[in-house]
Every structure is written in C-alpha cells, then in structure tokens.
C-alpha cells in the first residue's frame, strides 16, 4: 500500500525520495510520474534526471533538494485538488531487474479559510521507504533554458528553508534511504 502525504490547495506539496550515490557525482537516473509505478519507467513522467542533471520536467514539478547528493524529493508547486493521487518515484539502478520503486499517495485538502496567510510553508511531512528509476533520454530533451516561470529567488529560498529545516534532517536521519554500491 502507498504511504500517504498531505497538502492543502495552494500550497507546495513535498514527496520525499532519497538514495545514496555510490560515490560523489556517481548519479543514478531517477524519474517521477503521476500514477502508480508500473513495471518499467514512471507512468506519465513529470520529471526525470540522468547521470548528470535534471533533463526533463513539466510545469510546477521540480526538485528542491540537492539531487547530486541523492535527494530527489519532488516538490509540486501550488497544488490543486486535481493533483491528488498516486505518484511514482523510481531509481533505476543499472543491472538485471535492479530498479527500486515506491508509490506515494498525495491527498490534497481544501484550503483552510484563515484571515491572514502566514509565512509558514506546509511541506508534507512523512517519509516512505524508497523509490527508484532509470532511463536514458532522447536527443531532444529539454534544457535548463526552458524552465517554467518560477521565481529563482523563491526557489533558492525554498531550497534553503528545506535544507535547513529539522524536517529535512529528520528525514535524512530516518535510515529510509537506498544505498547504491
């Protein structure tokens, strides 16, 4: 069964997924998809990395953490009720049937009606076991020049907040991480 994560309409949802690279810079391709993890790949792919970089993504989906260190947790920006459902994170470790995969269930709640919004960002806090994927991209993959309209200062701020948060440390210290090599 899927591990469940929650977020409110209008917030950013956080779906955790980590692995430990065998060596610094020795990355494993990862994909995220909407829908449960099928036998190969990630259903409808929304984001993927290769051995070097994020080489494909779609609007509102991005990696907030340091994916070069194995933090491939997915952030979904400004969620709506339509974002509810199962997501697949897959780390494709080379070899014979080595893929690691995990299904995460995202539940979106209607926004609370509150007088004044606070600065607090509610990242969904819980952590599953682990997921994984592998794939090599086509020649015509998207480049960094085609980033969706996201404020880069906001990205940096969000990344720093998550990186510095106790939640991030707790997640990394939970031991629910795939080690490669």
């Amino acid at each position: 069964s899927e591990v469940e994560y929650r977020a409110e309409v209008g917030q950013n949802a956080y779906l955790p997924c980590f692995y430990t690279p065998a060596a610094p810079g020795n990355l494993v391709p990862v994909c995220w998809g909407k829908g449960a993890c099928p036998v190969f790949e990630c259903g409808n792919v929304v984001l993927r990395t290769d051995e070097r970089d994020v080489n494909y993504w779609t609007s509102r989906y991005w990696l907030n953490g340091d994916f070069r260190k194995g933090d491939v947790s997915l952030t979904i920006e400004n969620v709506t009720l339509a974002d509810s459902g199962i997501y697949c994170c897959r780390i494709q470790i080379p070899g014979i049937m080595n893929d690691e995969k995990f299904n995460l269930k995202l539940v979106i709640k209607p926004a609370k009606v509150t007088p004044a919004p606070t600065r607090q960002r509610d990242f969904t806090a819980a952590f599953p076991r682990m997921l994984t994927t592998r794939g090599h991209g086509p020649a015509e993959t998207q480049t960094l020049g085609s980033l969706p309209d996201i404020n880069l200062t906001q990205i940096s701020t969000l990344a720093n907040e998550l990186r510095d948060s106790r939640l991030a440390n707790d997640l990394r210290d939970s031991g629910a991480t795939i080690r490669i090599g």
Partner: antibody
Framework: EVKLVESGGGLVQPGGSLRLSCAAS????????MAWVRQAPGKGLEWVAN????????YYLDSLKSRFTISRDNAKNSLYLQMNSLKAEDTAVYYC???????????????WGQGTLVTVSS | DIQMTQSPSSLSASVGDRVTITCRAS??????LAWYQQKPGKSPQLLVY???TLAEGVPSRFSGSGSGTDFTLTISSLQPEDFATYYC?????????FGQGTKLEIK
C-alpha cells in the same frame, strides 16, 4: 512507418545456442524500451525479456534469465536475444516488440515484428 | 507473479453482435492493462493500452474499461475481420504476464 524485422531463427539441437536479431526502423530507437515475446506452437503469448533505452537495465522471465541475454545496439537500431542451453520447450515464434517510450504514458506493445521461428529438436 | 485470467476461453458470435471479453488480475494492476488481437499466422496487434485508450488506427467499435483487478474489452458490433484470438496483458508487475487468450469464432 514503424518496422521491426526479426532474423536468426532456425533449427537447433537441445543444448545449442542461437542469437536472434531485430532490425528497427521508422522511429527513434533509443527512445524506447524494447522487448522479446514468444509464442509456442498453438499456445498463448509469453513475455521473455525487456531492455531499457541504453541497455543498462534488463528484465527477464525468471526461468530464462540464466540462459537468455537481451541486448541492444542503438547505433545500429538493433535488438538482440542471445539464447544458450536451448531446450525443446523453448520452441516458439519469437517476436520483437516496441514497449514504453521515454515519457512513459503508453503501456503496451505498440508494434511487433513478424516473428522468427526457433525450433529446438534433435 | 500476477496471474491474468480471461473469460470466456472461447466464444461464438455473429456479425453485428455486441461482445464482451473479461480479464481479471490476481493483484491490483491499476490501469496498466493492454488488449491485443491476433489472427492465425500473424503477429499480435495492440488494440487498447492503459485499460481504456484506443491504440492508433483501431476502429471505434473496440473499447476497453476497468481498473484495479477487473477489465473488459467490448466490441460493439462485430465485423467479419474481428474473428480472432484476444489477449490481455499487464504492465504493472514483473514478469509481464498475458491472459490465456479468448478465441472469438463465427457462430
């Protein structure tokens, strides 16, 4: 037009080896997982193996993984199946099939070759 | 392994009939199900993928439905060229598995 053409089938004695090839054309070969599926005479379809885009990840029917090896050469738009220690029960038509693409989404074998017959008999 | 069970194994029908073939998975496969048609001496042809999406070039009289463990392929009005064997196949778990087939014959 998408085309998959298998070759390399034939009659082989039990314990022998055979290498099947599949020549692909009409699509960007390196953007797709590829598969081998077989069909024994008068029987149903049985999945044999799959390979990812660059050949770094492979998947097999458990009972075959010690004897069969799937590989690909993207520069030649070709898929291969090396079959060793062949048994009578490996007798079948072997099909090459195109599987899911780089962006996921379409889960099914959208295109099949015409098949190549492998007969294992003494 | 996920077992795929088709029913019926064979069925006789007439041109113009509405025909339904069912496929049951032994475990939840979500919507990762495909249907194929195979005629004697020919390669299988994809009809439906992701349980309900019609493959390119497939006539609209074919339709697929279901999710989870129970799936159906429906032919709304049988044509002479539809008499063949039909297979379901799951793309959720390894190994990939097919149903045993349903042979559709002319009554």
């Amino acid at each position: 037009e998408v085309k998959l053409v298998e070759s390399g089938g034939g009659l082989v004695q039990p314990g022998g080896s055979l290498r099947l090839s599949c020549a692909a054309s009409g699509f960007t070969f390196s953007d797709y997982y590829m598969a081998w599926v077989r069909q024994a005479p008068g029987k149903g379809l049985e999945w044999v193996a799959n390979i990812n885009y660059d050949g770094s990840s492979t998947y097999y029917l458990d009972s075959l993984k010690s004897r069969f090896t799937i590989s690909r050469d993207n520069a030649k738009n070709s898929l291969y199946l090396q079959m060793n220690s062949l048994k009578a029960e490996d007798t079948a038509v072997y099909y090459c099939a195109r599987d899911v693409g780089y962006y996921g989404g379409n889960y099914g074998f959208a295109y099949w070759g015409q098949g190549t017959l492998v007969t294992v008999s003494s | 392994d996920i077992q795929m069970t088709q029913s019926p194994s064979s069925l006789s029908a007439s041109v113009g009939d509405r025909v339904t073939i069912t496929c049951r998975a032994s475990d939840n496969i979500y919507s990762y199900l495909a249907w194929y048609q195979q005629k004697p001496g020919k390669s299988p042809q994809l009809l439906v993928y992701n349980a309900k999406t019609l493959a390119e070039g497939v006539p609209s009289r074919f339709s697929g439905s279901g999710s989870g463990t129970d799936f159906t392929l429906t032919i709304s009005s049988l044509q002479p060229e539809d008499f063949a064997t039909y297979y379901c196949q799951q793309h959720y778990g390894s190994p990939l598995t097919f149903g045993q087939g349903t042979k559709l014959e002319i009554k």
